[in-house]
Interface confidence: low
């Protein structure tokens, strides 16, 4: 019989608000009080096995004791009522768990979406954490009909998908109730026609067709989602070239009502474009569909839009009456080639004489010409047609080039090597820029580019390396032939020299020494040598440093001590730092020449 609890605690399963006060009462049973010879004075309250101070107890009568908590801060409290029996032994009477938390806040930001082909889903902001099991119920009704409640699942408490089919063009009222053990609150009601909450499926079967007539257009066709039957659609159509990462967009006003095709204009010829499309209700009420799967197409070819860059080189060793000329040109970039290049056509006309035609697949042509003046033309051909012609005058052998560019400068900027000049007063047809790496080990292999006659500043469009010395030549080209070339050296990026200068003595006297050194080879300079520093010291003395201009190759150290061993080394400096050469030692003689001890 005594397995029966000795009493009970009221309330049995309390749920209380955090930071509120709470009182529990323990009531002892008569039979227990008789058995253990106790009354309410013998009750000891404990929380989580720790005894509660007596100041929090109240003896209500001989059978009942209460305990009061102020500002409950724990979410879960194990509260036990115990009695002190014979010999101060504790006997548990009853235990409860006090759960604490917060009442629900009014749900906010209720919004609904009808994903096409699915039932309506609403979501909301449930407010602060309550620490209690809180049930959210989505309620909905027509003016004349209540729909079944939608109870949010525990793992997704702030959204719910209704169980009924969506009816468009009839307003529905929707709200959310939040309820837990501490209270119940209702969100604001929202009233809407579900047609304004539609998220269509994306258009599908997107395909791209090109046009032989126009190389600047591509026609898109697609299948609209079934929701087209319910709403008028508008579209976003985006496109990009295959290698681009950013999308361009068709002006939305051009795609503002239901359609299943669209012609995109102003595209580049022979270019692969990627397209995607999405749709939504035309008045902008609702949600954009996801993007369709991407589809790509290539615009039709067009004739090359530009003549290639065109230049020539003459072999300096020429036979009597003839010279070997190499005509060179650049491949057009894809956006100017506008198609697959088939071949190049070169014509050479001896001044006021006969014309020779050449069809070439390469980007150079070597010909033997007389010493006369020639006119060369170059066109490039693809499937659609030929480019305009590039025209070049190859002057006669005795031609004297004049009128160079002035104030030629070259400088690095933004990881590119820029060249600028002052234009000559005469009318320039174009400029040819040639550049090569200066090296003691290898010949200067030239790359080149062409610029319009209006240009006076450009950057070198090649794969340039850092810490290499580039010899850059700019030649203006006039109607009657090339002008005088002007050259300049430049670095894309300087570095300290790879080696320092090797110093040696040219002449050593009792109190002075003439040092000499060679200019550093260009391959190890890594930049413009701005100055040298000579460091010299005796074994026991301090080091002395002397700065020397970079144009010098010798220097005289004076005020030296006779009969002394000197250590000397030399550093060369570019704009990016210096490098020491090897150390060299010499000894000054005890006596000057002709001097006797």
């Amino acid at each position: 019989e005594l397995l029966d609890p000795c009493g009970y605690i009221s309330p049995e399963s309390p749920v209380v608000q955090l930071h509120s006060n709470f009182t529990a009462v323990c009531v002892l049973k008569e039979k227990c009080m008789d058995y253990f010879h106790v009354n309410a004075n013998y009750i000891v309250w404990k929380t989580n096995h720790f005894t509660i101070p007596k100041e929090q107890y109240t003896i209500i009568n001989r059978t009942a004791s209460s305990v009061t908590f102020t500002d409950i801060a724990s979410l879960n409290i194990q509260l036990t009522c115990n009695i002190l029996t014979f010999g101060q032994l504790e006997q548990n009477v009853y235990g409860i768990t006090i759960i604490s938390g917060l009442p629900p806040e009014k749900p906010k930001n209720l919004s609904c979406i009808v994903n096409e082909g699915k039932k309506m889903r609403c979501e909301w902001d449930g407010g602060r954490e309550t620490h209690l099991e809180t049930n959210f119920t989505l309620k909905s009704e027509w003016a004349t009909h209540k729909f079944a409640d939608c109870k949010a699942k525990r793992d997704t408490p702030t959204s719910c998908t209704v169980d009924y089919s969506t009816v468009y063009f009839v307003n529905i009222e929707v709200w959310v109730e939040a309820e837990n053990a501490l209270g119940k609150v209702t969100s604001d009601h929202i009233n809407f026609d579900p047609v304004y909450k539609v998220k269509p499926n994306p258009p599908h079967n997107l395909s791209v067709i090109n046009s032989e007539e126009l190389s600047s257009i591509l026609k898109l066709t697609w299948t609209n989602p079934s929701i087209k039957s319910v709403i008028i659609l508008k579209y976003n159509i985006q496109y990009r070239t295959k290698d681009a990462s950013t999308w361009s967009q068709i002006p939305p006003e051009d795609t503002a009502s239901t359609r299943s095709s669209f012609t995109v204009q102003d595209l580049k010829p022979f270019t692969e474009y990627v397209f995607r499309i999405r749709c939504m209700k035309e008045d902008g009420k609702g949600y954009w569909s996801d993007w369709s799967e991407e589809a790509s197409g290539i615009t039709y070819e067009d004739r090359p839009s530009k003549a290639p860059s065109f230049w020539y080189k003459i072999d300096p060793s020429h036979t009597q009456g003839y010279r070997t000329v190499q005509l060179v040109w650049k491949t057009l970039p894809p956006f100017e080639a506008n198609g697959k290049i088939l071949d190049y056509e070169v014509t050479l006309t001896r001044w006021k004489s006969h014309l020779q035609n050449y069809t070439v697949n390469a980007t150079k042509l070597t010909v033997n010409l007389t010493n006369d003046r020639y006119l060369a033309t170059l066109t490039v051909r693809n499937l659609v047609g030929k480019s305009d012609a590039a025209v070049l005058t190859i002057p006669a052998c005795d031609f004297q080039a004049t009128h160079p560019v002035m104030d030629l400068k070259a400088f690095p900027k933004d990881n590119m090597l820029w060249v600028e000049w002052t234009t000559p007063r005469e009318s320039v047809k174009k400029y040819i820029l040639e550049w090569c790496v200066l090296s003691d080990k290898a010949p200067c292999i030239t790359d080149w580019q062409q610029e319009d006659g209006t240009v006076h500043r450009t950057y070198l469009r090649g794969n340039l390396a850092e810490s290499k010395c580039y010899l850059i030549t700019v030649t203006p080209v006039y109607a009657d032939g090339p002008g005088s070339p002007e050259s300049i050296k430049a670095y894309l990026k300087q570095a300290p020299p790879s080696k320092g200068p090797t110093v040696r003595t040219k002449k050593v006297g009792k109190n002075e020494a003439v040092l000499e050194w060679d200019q550093l080879p260009v391959d190890v300079q890594n930049g413009f040598i701005r100055n040298y520093t000579i460091f010299y010291r005796t074994i026991i003395g301090n080091e002395t440093a002397v700065n020397v201009d970079s144009s010098h190759t010798e220097y005289t150290l004076s005020s030296l001590t006779s009969d002394t061993l000197y250590m000397v080394r030399m550093a060369a400096y570019t704009d990016e730092g210096g490098k020491d050469g090897p150390e060299f030692t010499f000894t000054t003689p005890k006596f000057a020449q002709g001097e006797i001890e």
Partner: antibody, heavy 129, light 108 residues
Framework: EVQLVQSGAEVKKPGESLKISCKGS????????IDWVRQMPGKGLEWMGI????????RYSPSFQGQVTMSVDKSISTAYLQWSSLKASDTAIYYC??????????????????????WGQGTTVTVSS | DIQMTQSPSSLSASVGDRVTITCRAS??????LNWYQQKPGKAPKLLIY???SLQSGVPSRFSGSGSGTDFTLTISSLQPEDFATYYC??????????FGQGTRLEIK
């Protein structure tokens, strides 16, 4: 003003072919379904089928499947109803009507809701030998 | 197919009368029912959609009610221009859309 204008009355012999038209104006023609409805002399209304002008999606009533063909030319906002071989029993007034967009969505199916809010004036077809 | 049955097939009434026409569906069609009015030699005209919604421009003396299988069109006070044939039409299950056989309303 939203309107549907149908082609004029036709008198034909059995076995002949026929194509009648219905031209929409005053609204986005490609965005609304077009219904075709038959009314035989002194009788009630019979629904023949429906076509969506933008992509020519067509649904026929089982009673008219294979008997008629519905088509559209969206470039001129016109819907057509045609017969390849007329019968005397095809004598009737044929109406086109704009199907006001109303639909119930249930899973992946759609149920047409509202009704035919704009009607053509009707085309009388008489088939007699 | 869903069958629509109208009653009566015809009825006579006077100007100012309250008139009720009923339409029964062979199975539940929820509220997917429309009412049309057709005058001789003219195309039908939509009066009521979704069982009880009044089409724009239709006088308020016309009203519709019902859901499931039983529907009613009521004209609260008959006017001379209301004498015509009335059709109910379901669009719950398509194809096909089906019409009732019509109710002819004549002047008494």
């Amino acid at each position: 003003e939203v309107q549907l204008v149908q082609s004029g009355a036709e008198v034909k012999k059995p076995g002949e072919s026929l194509k009648i038209s219905c031209k929409g104006s005053g609204y986005s023609f490609t965005s609304y379904w077009i219904d075709w409805v038959r009314q035989m002399p002194g009788k009630g209304l019979e629904w023949m089928g429906i076509i969506y002008p933008d992509d020519s999606d067509t649904r026929y009533s089982p009673s008219f499947q294979g008997q008629v063909t519905m088509s559209v030319d969206k470039s001129i906002s016109t819907a057509y109803l045609q017969w390849s071989s007329l019968k005397a029993s095809d004598t009737a007034i044929y109406y086109c009507a704009r199907h006001e967009r109303g639909i119930v969505e249930a899973g992946t199916d759609y149920y047409y809701y509202y009704g035919m809010d704009v009607w053509g004036q009707g085309t009388t077809v008489t088939v007699s030998s | 197919d869903i069958q629509m049955t109208q009653s009566p097939s015809s009825l006579s009434a006077s100007v100012g009368d309250r008139v009720t026409i009923t339409c029964r569906a062979s199975q539940s069609i929820s509220s997917y029912l429309n009412w049309y009015q057709q005058k001789p030699g003219k195309a039908p005209k939509l009066l009521i959609y979704a069982a009880s919604s009044l089409q724009s421009g239709v006088p308020s003396r016309f009203s519709g009610s019902g859901s499931g299988t039983d529907f009613t069109l009521t004209i609260s006070s008959l006017q001379p221009e209301d004498f015509a044939t009335y059709y109910c039409q379901q669009s719950y299950s398509t194809p096909p859309i089906t019409f009732g056989q019509g109710t002819r309303l004549e002047i008494k």
